[in-house]
Interface confidence: low
């Protein structure tokens, strides 16, 4: 058990100490049909865009981090699918800093795409406030880009 010693800034709590988790939701054991994935992506796109726009308005002047890479697409499937297990920890991490209703909806949709017993990876987020803001912005930008990419590939393939 890690015990917290002394006062710490918020963010060191969750953002800098994410733990590995096997999701309690029963995720599908097989890949969803493209029509279902498309519905989920359609649901995620406005949520992601809104979250990104809100954050950009609130945090003007924050640059994108060149040290952060969200491995949001699987490399082992064609067309690429959203790597839900890699993305979920980041959204659990930025939950405290965003509209909880939007984040919950995103997590709910990502959970549907997750394979059963697929572990979520542990992440480390910068403790420095400015770097943390930059990290969050980068995650939101990369997630939006990933959704666009998956959406395009779904539209170009069979419906």
């Amino acid at each position: 058990m890690l015990s917290h010693t002394g006062p710490s800034r918020f963010a060191l709590f969750l953002l800098c100490s994410m733990e590995t988790l096997l999701s309690s939701h029963m995720a599908p054991t097989h890949q969803l049909p493209p029509s279902d994935v498309r519905k989920i992506i359609l649901e995620l796109q406005p949520l992601s865009r809104g979250l990104l726009e809100d954050y950009q308005k609130k945090e003007t002047g924050v640059p994108e981090s060149n040290r952060t890479l969200l491995l949001c697409l699987t490399s082992d499937s064609q067309p690429p699918r959203l790597n839900s297990s890699a993305i979920l920890p980041y959204f659990r991490a930025i939950r405290p800093l965003s509209d909880k209703n939007i984040i919950d909806k995103i997590i709910e949709q990502l959970d549907k795409l997750k394979f059963q017993h697929e572990p979520e990876t542990e992440i480390s987020v910068p403790a420095d406030t400015f770097e943390c803001k930059s990290f969050i912005l980068t995650i939101l930008q990369q997630f939006s880009a990933c959704l666009e990419s998956v959406f395009k590939s779904l539209n170009s393939g069979p419906q």
């Epitope: 058990m1 917290h4 709590f13 733990e19 309690s24 609130k58 800093l97 909880k100």
Partner: antibody, heavy 118, light 111 residues
Amino acid sequence: EVQLVESGGDLVKPGGSLKLSCAASGFSFSNYGMSWVRQTPDKRLEWVATISYGGSYTYYPDNIKGRFTISRDNAKNTLYLQMSSLKSEDTAMYYCVRGYGYDTMDYWGQGTSVTVSS
Amino acid sequence: DILLTQSPASLAVSLGQRAIISCKASQSVSFAGTGLMHWYQQKPGQQPKLLIYRASNLEAGVPTRFSGSGSRTDFTLNIHPVEEEDAATYFCQQSREYPWTFGGGTKLEIK
């Protein structure tokens, strides 16, 4: 419907020990951080402990650290608070609280009463 | 520790009027542009209930007559128009830094 039901509160002598339990239902327990908050007889609220959703991370204020231990059993949907070296100032109503996003406490149980007196 | 000072300690407001409760922090409780201040309502014999989270977000199911505002060190809970059922004690709480702390409470009485 989210439900948090505390149990284990009792009258205990100074220096004694007690274990509180909180049975959770109506939500995916293992997806949420959980806390214990107490309310003293003069109605002041005090944060007691917090545990992360998987149980790996625990947090306490200095006056509690080393005496109380927060833990959870996700398979049983249960939160615990093991209290030892109890003092009269630990007399309070103890609430089990669900954490939202780790910084907001959005659902509180009805509480269980702990009295430390000789 | 961050000290939260609520004022007034008690207030009596006529039905339909506005109740304003203040919570001042001994240091900033904002992070990444978000005020990590929350408001709870507690009625006699009941557990606290979340009203407002992160300074200004209305918790689901809470009437829109409740609103929160503020940033950094100064936060306010507004209730307008006040109704009979709003008679309760209101607490602010910060989660910017450990240990999490609460204000001393404000008891609202309806005239």
